[in-house]
């Protein structure tokens, strides 16, 4: 805290400039208008200011605004935003785009801070959902923002928004994520052809269900073996040996190098033998000539 | 570990020149704000002036038109040409090395300048 005292004669700031970098900290607290600091917050952020000069700065904002400040100051806030609570933040209403990307832009380069993460919430709870321009500039400054929602907040996402994922913004999703991710992206994409449709559904894949790889299965989409080791392991348990081929095309012969991980070794387990020496691979561990298969599961079902 | 190490302070008559010099290691400079500050006897540290990472400089009013401070990226160095000196530029000068995104900044050693006949 700056202690209080008078502004030494002819010191008195009639705008925000760069002669205030040589104000010490007392000085700008007493000769700085917080509403004159305000109107001008534009300038700041073209001031030099020592980071300790920014703190003098932030508390007469605080004190103009107690109940947090409007959006007019926000937008402008600059290395201003750094210095910022989570409890700060919480009192803003910020409703436009360009007031978030300009707050980001500040912390760009860095990881998700506190502040930003809590800016983000406020922003899109005032939305009420994560709209496509929104989740553009998210995933543009945070590419691992979407994995960072809980499915509960993952289901406001509407399926136009999904037009903006990239590959890499799925990467550190989990099963659970991609659960509620996958529909979306499946509607979102109904519209386009087979092979057009396989690259950009391929990063959702890992959330779909069985009936849905059967289907890519009949449409030649060559699936990498990177995707597939994605997919969920009971989504992938019930596909036969032929399916599989289909699925992967040339990329079958990966199955060796994995036969060890799962998906492909509990899928392994499940299949005849004689199937699995089909693929000329290789590949062990498959279920030995002359042996019935119960599928427990389904006899549960049915009594 | 970061040092900021400066060089270049003296005794020097009234009309005369000095160049101090700040000298860095463990950070890379070009990054920084860099700033020079000045002390007097019983006096606060007062700015003198300053550098910005993308080169534009500012100076006190004292001192417009005698100091300039320039930087070296290559050498991680910044300097202080001093002209035209006067017995009231005699202090201790610091150099300083700040980022706006960051509490933490890092001072020289500070260096003797003393300007008498």
């Known amino acids: 805290e700056v202690e209080k005292t008078a502004c030494p004669s002819g010191k008195k700031a009639r705008e925000i400039d760069e002669s205030l970098i040589f104000y010490k900290k007392w000085e700008l607290e007493a000769c700085v208008d917080a509403a004159l600091l305000a109107t001008q917050m534009d300038r700041v952020n073209a001031i030099p200011f020592t980071y300790e000069q920014l703190d003098v700065l932030k508390h007469k904002l605080d004190e103009l605004y107690p109940q947090g400040y409007p959006e007019s100051v926000i937008q402008h806030l600059g290395y201003l935003f750094l210095k910022m609570s989570p409890e700060d933040i919480r009192k803003w209403n910020v409703t436009s785009l360009e007031t978030l990307k300009a707050l980001l832009e500040v912390n760009k380069g860095h990881e998700m801070s506190p502040q930003v993460a809590t800016l983000i919430d406020r922003f899109v709870k005032g939305r009420g959902q994560l709209d496509k321009d929104t989740l553009d500039t998210l995933t543009a400054f945070y590419p691992g923002y979407l994995c960072s929602l809980s499915p509960e907040e993952l289901s406001s996402v509407p399926p136009s928004s999904i037009w903006a994922v990239r590959p890499q913004d799925l990467d550190t999703c989990d099963p659970r994520q991609l659960d509620v991710l996958y529909p979306k992206a499946r509607l979102a994409f109904q519209n386009m052809n087979g092979s057009e449709y396989f690259v950009k559904i391929q990063s959702f894949l890992g959330g779909a269900p069985t009936e849905d790889l059967k289907a890519l299965s009949q449409q030649n989409v060559s699936m990498d073996l990177a995707t597939f080791m994605k997919l969920r392991t009971d989504a992938v348990l019930p596909l036969t040996v032929a399916e599989v081929q289909k699925l992967l095309g040339p990329h079958v012969e990966g199955l060796k190098a994995e036969e060890r991980h799962r998906p492909v070794r509990d899928w392994i387990l499940r299949q005849r033998q004689d199937d699995l020496d089909t693929l000329g691979l290789g590949l062990q561990g498959g279920i030995p000539n002359g042996y019935l298969v119960l599928d427990l599961s389904m006899q549960e079902a049915l009594s | 570990q970061v040092q900021l190490v400066q060089s270049g302070g003296g005794l020097v008559h009234p009309g005369g020149s000095l160049r101090l010099s700040c000298a860095a290691s463990g950070i890379d400079l070009s990054l920084y704000r860099m700033r020079w500050y000045r002390q007097a006897p019983g006096k606060e540290r007062d700015l003198v002036a300053l550098?910005?990472?993308?080169?534009?400089?500012y100076y006190e009013d004292s001192v417009k038109g005698r100091f300039t401070i320039t930087r070296d990226n290559p050498s991680n160095k910044v300097f202080l040409q001093m002209n035209s000196l006067k017995p009231e530029d005699t202090a201790v000068y610091y150099c300083?090395?700040?980022?706006?995104?960051?509490?933490?900044?890092?001072w020289g050693q500070g260096t003797q300048v003393t300007v008498s006949t």
């Open positions: 550098i910005t990472d993308d080169g534009t400089s």
């Open positions: 300083n090395a700040e980022t706006p995104l960051s509490p933490v900044n890092y």
